[in-house]
Interface confidence: low
């Protein structure tokens, strides 16, 4: 993992998410990526917090939905989380999300 | 029921360890991003680490870089805190806190980025 | 860093009376997603705190509707509708668009 690396969540990722939680390494939290994002979290590797992805995400996290735009997935969405490896807070992977 | 419990504080004297340990339960563990969260006496919160659902991605706020380190075992459901090099100033109350990341549905991803279970948090005391 | 600046840091309010808490921050919040990850947190006398608003204005699962949160950009505001005794704590902002995670210095709701 990244012990410090950026100040925002990480970026984009270029892996599919994992279930509830977003993994990074970076210091800001992750831009948008480029595949769908898990239900639960994000998985990535930069320091920034990611950013939703541009695939479909996954189906359990939050019970309500935000007041801001979704950032919609182009593929099928994964289960909880999504898995990403930038600098900032993970964002979205490029590939397919998992299920759960 | 969702449910976090913190073990491993107590008092250590300047220069010593300690090992925080976080039991998870009721929930997917390996699924989130976990965090240790502080609070010195009578004082506000402070982050202190966090680490991505897998373990891979860790940081750490700059008054603990390089002494503390932050560690999970997905098997275990648990969350580690190992705290090298003690100082007055790293007495507090430490909070183990899921965060919710969001999740995707229908094509499309939210958002949300917000502590939603804390634990009751475990008292690290440093002091000669 | 981003820095959280809340204001009062005492309310002390009259049950049934309105309260009003301001966080603000050293520079804007807004994460290159377009979300805004902005956080209330009530921390009950003798225990952990207790997640409330998300994202500027959204209420948790089971706060009570007499807590919103409303703001943009770097200004932020949590208002109780009408206090009640149970809502007696220490209140804070938190932002999580980036590393490090920040916290107010919180803000203390306590009865006339």
């Known amino acids: 993992g990244v012990t410090s690396a950026p100040d925002t969540r990480p970026a984009p990722g270029s892996t599919a998410p994992p279930a509830h939680g977003v993994t990074s390494a970076p210091d800001t939290r992750p831009a948008p990526g480029s595949t769908a994002p898990p239900a639960h979290g994000v998985t990535s590797a930069p320091d920034t917090r990611p950013a939703p992805g541009s695939t479909a995400p996954p189906a359990h996290g939050v019970t309500s939905a935000p007041d801001t735009r979704p950032a919609p997935g182009s593929t099928a969405p994964p289960a909880h989380g999504v898995t990403s490896a930038p600098d900032t807070r993970p964002a979205p992977g490029s590939t397919a999300p998992p299920a759960h | 029921q969702v449910q976090l419990v913190e073990s491993g504080g107590g008092l250590v004297k300047p220069g010593g360890s300690l090992r925080l340990s976080c039991a998870a339960s009721?929930?997917?563990?390996?699924?989130?991003?976990m965090s240790w969260i502080r609070q010195a006496p009578g004082k506000g919160l402070e982050w202190v680490s966090y680490?991505?659902?897998?373990?891979?991605?860790?940081y750490y706020a700059d008054s603990v870089k390089g002494r503390f380190t932050i560690s999970r075992d997905n098997a275990k459901n648990s969350l580690y805190l190992q705290m090298n090099s003690l100082r007055a100033e790293d007495t507090a109350v430490y909070y183990c806190?899921?965060?919710?990341?969001?999740?995707?549905?229908?094509?499309?991803?939210?958002?949300?980025?917000?502590?939603?279970?804390w634990g009751k948090g475990t008292t690290v005391t440093v002091s000669s | 860093d981003i820095v959280m600046t809340q204001t009062p840091l005492s309310s002390p309010v009259t049950l049934g009376q309105p309260a009003s808490i301001s966080c603000r921050s050293s520079?804007?919040?807004?994460?290159?997603?377009?979300?805004?990850?902005l956080s209330w947190l009530q921390q009950r006398p003798g225990q952990p705190p207790r997640l409330l608003i998300y994202?500027?204005?959204n209420r948790f699962s089971g706060v009570p509707d007499r807590f919103s949160g409303s703001g943009a950009g770097t200004d932020f505001t949590l208002k109780i509708s009408r206090v009640e005794a149970e809502d007696v704590g220490v209140y804070y902002c938190?932002?999580?668009?980036?590393?490090?995670?920040?916290f107010g210095g919180g803000t203390k709701v306590e009865i006339k």
């Open positions: 806190v899921r965060e919710n990341i969001g999740y995707c549905t229908g094509g499309n991803c939210f958002y949300y980025y917000y502590m939603d279970v």
């Open positions: 009721g929930f997917t563990f390996s699924d989130y991003y």
């Open positions: 680490i991505s659902s897998s373990g891979t991605t860790k």
């Open positions: 520079q804007s919040l807004v994460h290159s997603d377009g979300n805004t990850y």
């Open positions: 994202k500027i204005s």
């Open positions: 938190m932002q999580a668009t980036q590393f490090p995670l920040t």
